[in-house]
Interface confidence: low
């Protein structure tokens, strides 16, 4: 089938005491094919500091994940989530504390 | 513009510890991830260590690993590597880069300084 | 870690020939990934080419760079005297980072 590009979401929520974890969620992509990571600074972020989702068919012929880490409150502006699919890549910012979800349709 | 100035090179014996320091200036220090590359006298590049803007995500090569410590003062704009149990290996020019955090690589080097690590 | 392969070690190059450099990664890396630096004798690097095929500021037009997975490559469509350095392909994919042995450019 052709290139189905994903649809990336970028959301927030309390952890514990000045920490929240950042969660970010590509949907509806096709090929299953998928890099998402979170960056800090511009760096991939260690594995063992990420939680990985499965890619899981989403019904619809194309795919879902996710990737999350937690990080210290205040710092939200240092971290971005990294995608690439297909030969494209965009990086989504962090949600500030009053805006939890950030779209994009990645074309 | 953007500088970078290392210092604190020069000989030590083998066993020995040396501390490198790094002043940074023209750019907003504390908002840039660091690192040390060093080049062993006609070899190749070698990356040392990497720390970010907040000095809560740090790398070692394997080589240096255990051994040195790269650490950082932004309020006073200086980067350090703390080098201890020195090998004839480690003679190297050490130099001090600047992250690029949009595009990644390596955007502003230092001059370097020489480490020299010599019975 | 991922070890960067550059090939060839040495490269004697006359003016105006067209030079090619391959970096080969031991695993696939993504392209926004990987970099090449130039280096003159006596001089700090400079960053080259950034995310494989961005040319970095007041780099001439004559440089390119390709590839992705595996195999990437900086070409020198017309080679110019200045051009003589050494070139070293450099991935932060995955910590350690780590940087190619290098490419020689020397004029025939």
């Known amino acids: 089938g052709s290139t189905v590009p994903p649809m990336v979401n970028v959301t927030r929520s309390e952890a514990s005491e000045g920490n929240i974890t950042v969660t970010c969620r590509a949907s509806s992509f096709y090929p299953r094919n998928i890099i998402l990571t979170w960056r800090q600074d511009g760096v991939s972020l260690s594995h063992d500091t990420q939680q990985w989702g499965d890619v899981l068919p989403d019904g619809n012929g194309t795919y879902q994940t996710w990737v999350a880490t937690r990080i210290c409150r205040g710092e939200e502006q240092r971290f971005t989530c990294y995608m690439e699919h297909s030969g494209n890549h965009s990086t989504h910012p962090v949600p500030s504390g009053n805006s939890h979800h950030h779209h994009h349709h990645h074309h | 513009d953007v500088h970078l100035v290392e210092s604190g090179g020069g000989l030590v014996q083998p066993g020995g510890s040396r501390k490198l320091s790094c002043a940074a200036s023209g750019f907003t220090f504390n908002t840039f991830g660091m690192n040390w590359v060093r080049q062993a006298p006609e070899k190749g590049l070698e990356w040392v260590a990497y720390?970010?803007?907040?000095?809560?995500?740090?790398y070692y090569a394997d080589t240096v690993k255990g051994r040195f410590t790269i650490s950082r003062d932004n309020p006073k704009n200086t980067l350090f590597l703390q080098m201890t149990s020195l090998r004839s290996e480690d003679t190297a020019m050490y130099y001090c880069t600047r992250w690029e955090p949009v595009t990644g690589g390596f955007s502003y080097w230092g001059q370097g300084t020489l480490v020299t690590v010599s019975a | 870690q991922i070890v960067l392969t550059q090939s060839p070690a040495f490269k004697s190059s006359s003016l105006g020939e067209r030079v090619t450099m391959t970096c080969t990664a031991s695993?696939?890396?993504?392209?926004?990934?990987l970099h090449w630096y130039q280096q003159k004798p006596g001089s700090s690097p400079k960053l080259w080419i950034y995310t494989t095929s961005n040319l970095a500021s007041g780099v001439p037009a004559r440089f390119s760079g390709s590839g992705s997975g595996t195999s990437y490559s900086l070409t020198i469509s017309t080679m110019e005297a200045e051009d003589a350095a050494t070139y070293y392909c450099?991935?932060?994919?995955?910590?350690?980072?780590?940087f190619g042995s290098g490419t020689k450019v020397e004029i025939k």
């Open positions: 695993s696939s890396i993504s392209s926004s990934y």
């Open positions: 450099h991935q932060h994919h995955r910590s350690p980072f780590t």
């Open positions: 720390i970010n803007s907040g000095s809560n995500t740090i």
